[in-house]
């Protein structure tokens, strides 16, 4: 039994890091493998993660972590019974994938303005809380070409757009994702999408 693709890990910079790897053949990850991880910190203890299958030869492990700070470093040991298959380390602050924003809501009752709001996925005491920026994706269910991205580079989790920038009388969907420039993170997953029917009053034409 050998590791084909070494474990790569990403952290949500809160409490969970996810590590994925591939074996050289079909593997029952949960019965055959264990990922031991330990914070490099005086007197800390090792923890065991039981991996799950992620495709035939792929494995994934969700590591529970103490509140993450930038200096944290973990040792990782991948075991198959008594055989050490791979040894490595992981610094969560250097491999951050933020949590996805939640509670995306479209408010359509503000004159002819659409107000989209969502929730920051971090508590106020987390470092990323004040460092997230967002991308909002809006698309038409009727017209695949009607697809747009709005970059929200301010901290407030909201976006205002004129309803008239979208077509009237049809349904749209929106979703939002986050990233943090300070840690050069990857983008989060997209939030669940929300749907609304776009309608607004066309201005009267003057002749």
């Amino acid at each position: 039994m050998k590791v084909l693709q070494e474990p790569t890990c990403v952290s949500d910079y809160m409490s969970i890091s996810t590590c994925e790897w591939k074996m050289n053949g079909p593997t029952n990850c949960s019965t055959e493998l264990r990922l031991l991880y330990q914070l490099v910190f005086l007197l800390s203890e090792a923890h065991t993660c039981i991996p799950e299958n992620n495709g035939g030869a792929g494995c994934v492990c969700h590591l529970l972590m103490d509140d993450v700070v930038s200096a944290d470093n973990y040792t990782l040991d991948l075991w198959a019974g008594q055989q050490l298959l791979w040894k490595g380390s992981f610094k969560p602050s250097e491999h951050v994938k933020p949590r996805a924003p939640g509670n995306l809501t479209v408010h359509t009752n503000v004159s002819d303005t659409l107000l989209l709001t969502w929730s920051n996925p971090y508590p106020p005491d987390n470092y990323l809380y004040n460092h997230l920026t967002y991308a909002v994706n809006i698309w038409s269910e009727n017209d695949p070409a009607d697809f747009r991205i709005y970059n929200v580079t301010y901290l407030e989790p909201s976006l205002r757009i004129a309803a008239s920038t979208l077509k009237s009388g049809i349904s749209y969907r929106a979703r939002v994702r986050a990233w943090a420039q300070c840690y050069n993170t990857t983008w989060s997953e997209w939030s669940p999408s929300t749907k609304w029917h776009n309608s607004y009053r066309e201005p009267f034409e003057q002749h």
Epitope: L39, V40, F41, L42, S44, D66, D67, V69, A71, N73, D125
Partner: nanobody
Framework: EVQLVESGGGLVQPGGSLRLSCAAS????????MAWFRQAPGKGLEAVAS????????YYADSVKGRFTISRDNSKNTLYLQMNSLRAEDTAVYYC????????????WGKGTLVTVSS
Amino acid sequence: EVQLVESGGGLVQPGGSLRLSCAASGSTSYRYCMAWFRQAPGKGLEAVASIRPRSGRAYYADSVKGRFTISRDNSKNTLYLQMNSLRAEDTAVYYCAASDNDGNCQDYWGKGTLVTVSS
């Protein structure tokens, strides 16, 4: 210059309690790792307890688990060690130690405070 100054040591009877304090001062108030070590007469240095910077999660040597409690007050830049159910084998010089960027807690040291457990 980082300075760590311990206080609170003394003579206590077996089964008694003491609370050690360590006041930190210097270039930055933030310390990634803070810990207590001890050295008993004629013995080597032993790590007693360590504490995380934000969560306050604590780690202990098996010999003191359930009896000692480490805590830190970041606003006062002070580290504490509450020692209960003291035993003769806890007699030692107790040192406060810290580090800024790694988990060894051994970049900065105090001068130590003597704890004697004897009847």
